[in-house]
């Protein structure tokens, strides 16, 4: 008995071939011997089966001795043994229809779980293997679960259902709703304007929701809400903003915030959350601000950084075009009695400068100038 696998919602064509290459009488029946369709001369006749409005054949092939049964918009319950009666012969074809669906929605928040459920006919024992867009394979039976979805899981998932050594492939498009970056870090000299950007990693027709930026300053004991906003059809409107600092927010996507001045008291970490309409859970992006200050007080030239720096970073003070006078894995370094000239304070990661601040040291009888 021939086995054919079909996909729910698709069309399947079951073949039936006579030895004579001409149009002769044929009938298709189901396992209950109920006639589905057949012919009477050159006319197609249909029986009283449930497939009535979804069953068809190809009259153009009859003259070649081919009498296919076409079933449109397949349903799981169409799984059955179909019998083609032609030339006193009976050809049996077992049709097994499978369906694969994603739980609730194919638009899921980063960190949520994706569950794929296989609908299969009674008596079948299929195995399923799915390949994610990033090439990760998962296997299972009736259900497959992927916890903690990541941004790279966005795209087409290809799932293969295997039954009786035959396979049928499903493609499911999954959109992981997330920010492009989970975390970002901004390095600024004291007094500079700070730009925070929060680009989304997906595009949808209409985007509605609300968001908030909570900030934990390094110097503060508790976190504070810096701004709350609404998002309506990709338009941003500020609901509430603190007076210190007074952030400004762009009116269009991507979400964009401006801090007028980088100051040591603002250095720290923020968490921007975005709650989307009709979605449970929130999108998150962490943002960090590191602020550098170079100062000269009497005979002491000091360079300091505030904010979430890594222990890998090196802080150095050097006279322009000279070797570093001091270079340590600290958040503050200093030089006593610095010689006159342009001094550079450098924050670097493995030799790569992340942040630089210059301070001019004048001969001892003058006061320092900050460029």
């Amino acid at each position: 008995k021939k086995v054919v696998l079909g996909k729910k919602g698709d069309t399947v064509e079951l073949t039936c071939t006579a030895s004579q290459k001409k149009s002769i009488q044929f009938h298709w029946k189901n396992s209950n011997q109920i006639k589905i369709l057949g012919n009477q001369g050159s006319f197609l006749t249909k029986g009283p089966s449930k497939l009535n409005d979804r069953a068809d054949s190809r009259r153009s092939l009859w003259d070649q001795g081919n009498f296919p049964l076409i079933i449109k918009n397949l349903k799981i319950e169409d799984s059955d043994t179909y019998i083609c009666e032609v030339e006193d012969q009976k050809e049996e074809v077992q049709l097994l229809v499978f369906g694969l669906t994603a739980n609730s929605d194919t638009h899921l928040l980063q960190g949520q779980s994706l569950t794929l459920t296989l609908e299969s006919p009674p008596g079948s024992s299929p195995s399923v293997q799915c390949r994610s867009p990033r090439g990760k394979n998962i296997q299972g039976g009736k259900t497959l679960s992927v916890s903690q979805l990541e941004l790279q899981d966005s795209g087409t998932w290809t799932c293969t259902v295997l039954q009786n050594q035959k396979k049928v492939e499903f493609k499911i498009d999954i959109v992981v709703l997330a920010f492009q970056k989970a975390s970002s870090i901004v390095y600024k000299k004291e007094g500079e304007q700070v730009e925070f950007s929060f680009p989304l990693a997906f595009t949808v027709e209409k985007l509605t929701g609300s968001g908030e930026l909570w900030w934990q300053a390094e110097r503060a004991s508790s976190s504070k809400s810096w701004i709350t906003f609404d998002l309506k059809n990709k338009e941003v409107s500020v609901k509430r903003v603190t007076q210190d600092p007074k952030l400004q927010m762009g009116k269009k996507l991507p979400l964009h915030l401006t801090l007028p001045q980088a100051l040591p008291q603002y250095a720290g970490s923020g968490n921007l959350t975005l709650a989307l309409e009709a979605k449970t859970g929130k999108l998150h992006q962490e943002v960090n601000l590191v602020v550098m200050r170079a100062t000269q007080l009497q005979k002491n030239l000091t360079c300091e950084v505030w904010g979430p720096t890594s222990p890998k970073l090196m802080l150095s003070l050097k006279l322009e075009n000279k070797e570093a006078k001091v270079s340590k894995r600290e958040k503050a370094v200093w030089v006593l009695n610095p010689e006159a000239g342009m001094w550079q304070c450098l924050l670097s990661d493995s030799g790569q400068v992340l942040l630089e601040s210059n301070i001019k040291v004048l001969p001892t009888w003058s006061t320092p100038v900050q460029p």
Epitope: P311, L313, K328, E330, S348, D349, S350, Q352
Partner: antibody, heavy 120, light 113 residues
Framework: QVQLVQSGAEVKKPGASVKVSCKAS????????MNWVRQAPGQGLEWMGI????????SYARKFQGRVTMTRDTSTSTVYMELSSLRSEDTAVYYC?????????????WGQGTLVTVSS | DIVMTQSPDSLAVSLGERATINCKSS????????????VAWYQQKPGQPPKLLIY???TRESGVPDRFSGSGSGTDFTLTISSLQAEDVAVYYC?????????FGGGTKVEIK
């Protein structure tokens, strides 16, 4: 697996220059800084400097400033160390060493070493 | 520059016995900002490059046997081999990476008594 493969031994005359290469494989080349460390025969280890392959920026030990140049070729995942104005005391095994994941100063993978002999 | 001074220069220990190597830095390598000691220990066998054993003064590199341990803080550091094996015969170096230039100790040669 991570591998650092260095160029072969060199014999140079005083005053000449030498260029040693170090080809990296088994990891993302631009994600880890590379250091150069030398070891004179029967002596200890001496740090020469560092290159950050992602931007090409360098930092050299004061002792070698003006004589050493570290470069990289991201297309071949190779770093180079050129030492000029060679003298007999530069005779040593030169190692490239990848910076570790943690403190950016501990070296978790080393090349096999390149012996540079300076002799008239 | 920070000077790293190792002692002893050489050490002969019986198989299965404890070996202790000391390293002293000329100034503290404990970062007050990050509360970390920027000290690493390496093992070097003849004709081979050094091999990282310990970083952050006391964290063992993956794949390093647990008979190797590091301790100390500030300016005084110790590498201990709890039960010396034949394959541990080598020269051991300490290194600071708190400040540039990065510097190494002079090395301690460990032999079997």
């Amino acid at each position: 697996q991570v591998q650092l493969v260095q160029s072969g031994a060199e014999v140079k005359k005083p005053g000449a220059s030498v260029k040693v290469s170090c080809k990296a494989s088994g990891y993302t080349f631009t994600s880890y800084a590379m250091n150069w460390v030398r070891q004179a025969p029967g002596q200890g280890l001496e740090w020469m400097g560092i290159i950050n392959p992602s931007g090409g920026s360098t930092s050299y030990a004061r002792k070698f400033q003006g004589r050493v140049t570290m470069t990289r070729d991201t297309s071949t995942s190779t770093v180079y160390m050129e030492l000029s104005s060679l003298r007999s005391e530069d005779t040593a095994v030169y190692y490239c060493a990848r910076e570790g994941d943690y403190g950016s100063g501990e070296f978790d993978y080393w090349g096999q070493g390149t012996l540079v002999t300076v002799s008239s | 520059d920070i000077v790293m001074t190792q002692s002893p220069d050489s050490l002969a220990v019986s198989l299965g016995e404890r070996a202790t190597i000391n390293c002293k830095s000329s100034q503290s390598v404990l970062s007050s900002s990050y509360n970390k000691n920027y000290v690493a220990w390496y093992q070097q066998k003849p004709g081979q490059p050094p091999k990282l054993l310990i970083y952050w003064a006391s964290t063992r590199e993956s794949g390093v046997p647990d008979r190797f341990s590091g301790s100390g803080s500030g300016t005084d550091f110790t590498l201990t081999i709890s039960s010396l094996q034949a394959e541990d015969v080598a020269v051991y170096y300490c290194q600071q990476y708190y400040s540039t230039p990065l510097t190494f100790g002079g090395g301690t040669k460990v032999e079997i008594k």
